[in-house]
């Protein structure tokens, strides 16, 4: 946030940039949390825009029995590995075809025993406040589907009739990692020393990191004709004086008519 300065007072302004603001020759360049001519004001909203998508990674092991292990399969650049990867990917795409969050598989290692396939199942979902539940459900469906296929697609008399066959007992889920996104935590961190006063409110399932000085939210502070200003002790209303009234009170809701205070002296002017 920047505020431009014109005229003779600019040199004075340069030395007076506050809150870590820096002078660029024309104006104070303010850090994210501040704005104003001297970076003296605290912003009332902080952009913590969530990622568009949240990812999860499941580390799985399955044992493929319809391919015999050869040493070339250890080499990821070999033709053997590439052909295995192609078939395995196609097979898994069929297995997980009903899961909207499924993105694909990534083979990390092939080892002996027929072919033990260490791989990651990659999941992704659009960010919503319920993303954890969505991904938790998807990981459960992945477990169900891989268990089912490795039970059903098995060798009979050393022959496989499917694209791939598996050892029923060789299926294991090692680990599940979900990308963590915590808007409340991000909001607190980005608000720094004002963190106690900033909160997350949702609008159209999007999180907004706001202080009570941001209008239009349930926590918004109504300063009436005054101005809401954030300080280290919290949001405060700075009340205004008009030609006819002084305003006071915590929310500037108490107006005193100047003519009542000045009385008849006011009329002699």
């Amino acid at each position: 946030r920047t505020t431009t300065c014109f005229g003779d007072g600019c040199q004075n302004t340069a030395s007076r940039c506050k809150n870590g603001g820096t002078w660029d020759g024309l104006k104070c360049q303010c850090p994210n949390l501040y704005y104003g001519e001297l970076c003296e004001e605290v912003v009332s909203s902080i952009d913590i825009g969530p990622p568009e998508t949240i990812s999860a990674q499941m580390e799985l092991t399955v044992t493929v029995t319809s391919v015999k292990f050869t040493e070339e399969l250890k080499n990821h650049s070999s033709q053997e590995f590439q052909e295995f990867k192609q078939t395995f990917t196609e097979q898994m795409n069929i297995v997980y075809s009903g899961i909207p969050e499924y993105v694909g598989v990534n083979i990390t290692k092939l080892r002996l025993g027929s072919v033990v396939v260490e791989h990651d199942v990659l999941l992704r979902t659009k960010y919503t406040p319920e993303y954890k539940t969505v991904l938790d459900n998807a990981t459960e469906v992945v477990k169900e589907k891989i268990t089912k296929v490795t039970t059903q697609q098995i060798m009979i008399n050393d022959i496989c009739s499917d694209m791939m066959c598996f050892n029923t007992t060789g299926t294991q889920v090692q680990n599940i990692t979900v990308t963590q996104y915590d808007p409340e935590e991000d909001c607190r961190k980005m608000a720094k020393e004002y963190g106690d006063y900033f909160v997350v409110e949702y609008r159209d399932q999007k999180p907004y990191c706001i202080s009570p000085c941001e209008p239009g939210f349930s926590v918004s502070k109504n300063c009436n004709l005054g101005k809401c200003q954030m300080s280290l002790s919290g949001p405060q209303c700075l009340c205004v004086t008009t030609e006819t009234h002084w305003y006071s009170g915590e929310t500037c809701n108490q107006g005193t008519q100047k003519s009542l205070v000045y009385g008849h002296h006011h009329h002699h002017h």
Partner: nanobody, 123 residues
Framework: EVQLVESGGGVVQPGGSLRLSCAAS????????WGWFRQRPGKEREAVAL???????FYADSVKGRFTISQDNSKNTLYLQMNSLRAEDTAMYYC?????????????????WGQGTQVTVSS
């Protein structure tokens, strides 16, 4: 990239014989798996005879004792000797290959395919 070219198809009377050949380009012939598949009109492609570099072979029940799969590594060629041919053997015959040592009859597991050669058994 493996290139496969079949030959040897034709029209033969029931009880007759044919020998199909599949010439492969590339240096992968001595490893992996090789096979013959066929597709009859209106049917799915099916495994007829398969062979792997570890010596494993497979024959479909309907051709056991009549068909023989073999390969000549020096010529990079796969063969299918077909004897006692029947009308139900009429089909397009395809050569297939994979550098993997496979144990599957499913065509989707096989990566390299020829264009096919037609075999018609008719009197």
């Amino acid at each position: 990239e493996v290139q496969l070219v079949e030959s040897g198809g034709g029209v033969v009377q029931p009880g007759g014989s044919l020998r199909l050949s599949c010439a492969a380009s590339g240096d992968t012939f001595s490893r992996g798996s090789w096979g013959w598949f066929r597709q009859r009109p209106g049917k799915e492609r099916e495994a007829v005879a398969l062979i792997s570099s570890d010596g494993w072979t497979f024959y479909a029940d309907s051709v056991k004792g009549r068909f023989t799969i073999s390969q000549d590594n020096s010529k990079n060629t796969l063969y299918l000797q077909m004897n006692s041919l029947r009308a139900e053997d009429t089909a397009m015959y395809y050569c297939a290959a994979s550098v993997l040592v496979l144990r599957t009859l499913n065509p989707k597991a096989w990566h390299h395919w020829g264009q096919g050669t037609q075999v018609t058994v008719s009197s």
